[in-house]
């Protein structure tokens, strides 16, 4: 039940990458506005995005307080210009979101190859340690800070003249791989959390190739 002329939100969906977390829903409002509330399973409800005509609400500030908690959100619908109005049951119409556990469910953002350096037949490839919006002691934590050894990177590397992709893995942000002397190689990395069952992998980083600006070559 609810106020006449208001409809309940539906298709509540969490969109989250590297802990930047937005709740989206439908429909686009016609003569109504929305307020969102978020809570942990054991906590109190906190209101966000008051009386908005948007169909999304950035909840990052709330979920980064404890990314291992499980959160629930709900979206309230109110008649535009009459937000005190309630439904016949004495409260506004609302719809619950699915539960969301950021640590287990946030998508891994596209990684970036920071640099690569060749020394003889070895190449050191470094992945940028992306900053998240998770804070500790007033400092923003990196993806590695948050996930620790749960996060690995897979490096795909191949000779510029060939199509077969070799792989290497690391639970740091650095790879040291063997290459053939005199050959140019290309690189792409993927972030992976092997312990997950869903949202396990990021999209691939942009491809970087030797002979381009990111790299450095030293003959030893």
């Amino acid at each position: 039940s609810g106020t006449t002329n208001t409809v309940a939100a539906y298709n509540l969906t969490w969109k989250s990458t590297n802990f930047k977390t937005i709740l989206e829903w439908e429909p686009k409002p016609v003569n109504q506005v929305y307020t969102v509330q978020i809570s942990t399973k054991s906590g109190d409800w906190k209101s966000k995005c008051f009386y908005t005509t948007d169909t999304e609400c950035d909840l990052t500030d709330e979920i980064v307080k404890d990314v291992k908690q499980t959160y629930l959100a709900r979206v309230f619908s109110y008649p535009a210009g009459n937000v005190e109005s309630t439904g016949s049951a004495g409260e506004p119409l609302y719809e619950n979101s699915p539960e969301f556990t950021p640590y287990l469910e946030t998508n891994l953002g596209q990684p970036t190859i920071q640099s690569f350096e060749q020394v003889g037949t070895k190449v050191n490839v470094t992945v940028e340690d992306e900053r998240t919006l998770v804070r500790r002691n007033n400092t923003f934590l990196s993806l590695r800070d948050v996930f620790g050894k749960d996060l690995i990177y897979t490096l795909y590397y191949w000779k510029s003249s060939s199509s077969g992709k070799k792989t290497a893995k690391t639970n740091t942000n650095e790879f040291l791989i063997d290459v053939d002397k005199g050959e140019n190689y290309c690189f792409s990395v993927q972030a992976v959390i092997p312990s997950r069952t869903v949202n396990r992998k990021s999209t691939d980083s942009p491809v970087e190739c030797m002979g381009q600006e990111k790299g450095e070559f030293r003959e030893i």
């Epitope: 795909y156 639970n171 063997d178 069952t197």
Partner: antibody, heavy 120, light 107 residues
């Protein structure tokens, strides 16, 4: 329940072609890497190649390079092994296996295998 | 490619025996070695990962160890269901490579 089911094996003449399928259930193949491994009668395990279905990247053993092609259809949650220019020495049971891309273990689930016999 | 040299190729043992199988990598593979058990007509099953960790559901009589590039699979007290072929595998670099296999037969 995680399951891999291979199909498409059979008898084929030297120089012929065959396409094997590896149908996955209980997980999404694009979240993993899929390998093909073969075993000739009475012999050991030989790695054939892999595909990462999320980006299409592949790599092959030298023994099959240029003749075999691994592909995946994520909408069908299935990986394929296209085998061309088959030789008698390609006779084997072919397995697909799931790789969770962990530092710690490679192939945690295997299919039951499908037999490919190359003979005239 | 990294070679995995496995020995012995076969052994005969009795129920209750302690059995040891070794694998030597041709170069450093860190701890990226797994052991599999295979029975006739069946797919291989993962026993040990990361050189020494027991995979879920595997009996504790199986264990693995590493010393440099040498890797060992030990069955502390052989059971009737353990008669099978065992393979080591490195997954440190592409291509992943297997040992030749060790067939454990009944004496």
């Amino acid at each position: 329940e995680v399951q891999l089911v291979e199909s498409g094996g059979g008898l084929v003449q030297p120089g012929g072609s065959l396409r094997l399928s590896c149908a996955a259930s209980g997980f999404t193949i694009s979240d993993y890497v899929i390998h093909w491994v073969r075993q000739a009668p009475g012999k050991g395990l030989e790695w054939v190649g892999y595909i990462d279905p999320s980006n299409g990247y592949t790599y092959y053993a030298d023994s099959v390079k240029g003749r075999f092609t691994i592909s995946a259809d994520t909408s069908k949650n299935t990986a394929y092994l296209q085998m061309n220019s088959l030789r008698a020495e390609d006779t084997a049971v072919y397995y697909c296996a799931r790789d969770p891309q962990s530092l710690f273990y490679p192939f945690d689930y295997w299919g039951q295998g499908t037999l490919v016999t190359v003979s005239s | 490619d990294i070679q995995m040299t496995q020995s012995p190729s076969s052994l005969s043992a009795s129920v209750g025996d302690r059995v040891t199988i070794t694998c030597r990598a041709s170069q450093d593979v860190n701890t990226a070695v797994a052991w599999y058990q295979q029975k006739p007509g069946k797919a291989p099953k993962l026993l040990i990962y990361s050189a020494s960790f027991l995979y879920s559901g595997v009996p504790s009589r199986f264990s693995g160890s590493r010393s440099g590039t040498d890797f060992t699979l030990t069955i502390s007290s052989l059971q009737p269901e353990d008669f099978a072929t065992y393979y080591c595998q490195q997954h440190y670099t592409t291509p992943p490579t297997f040992g030749q296999g060790t067939k454990v037969e009944i004496k």
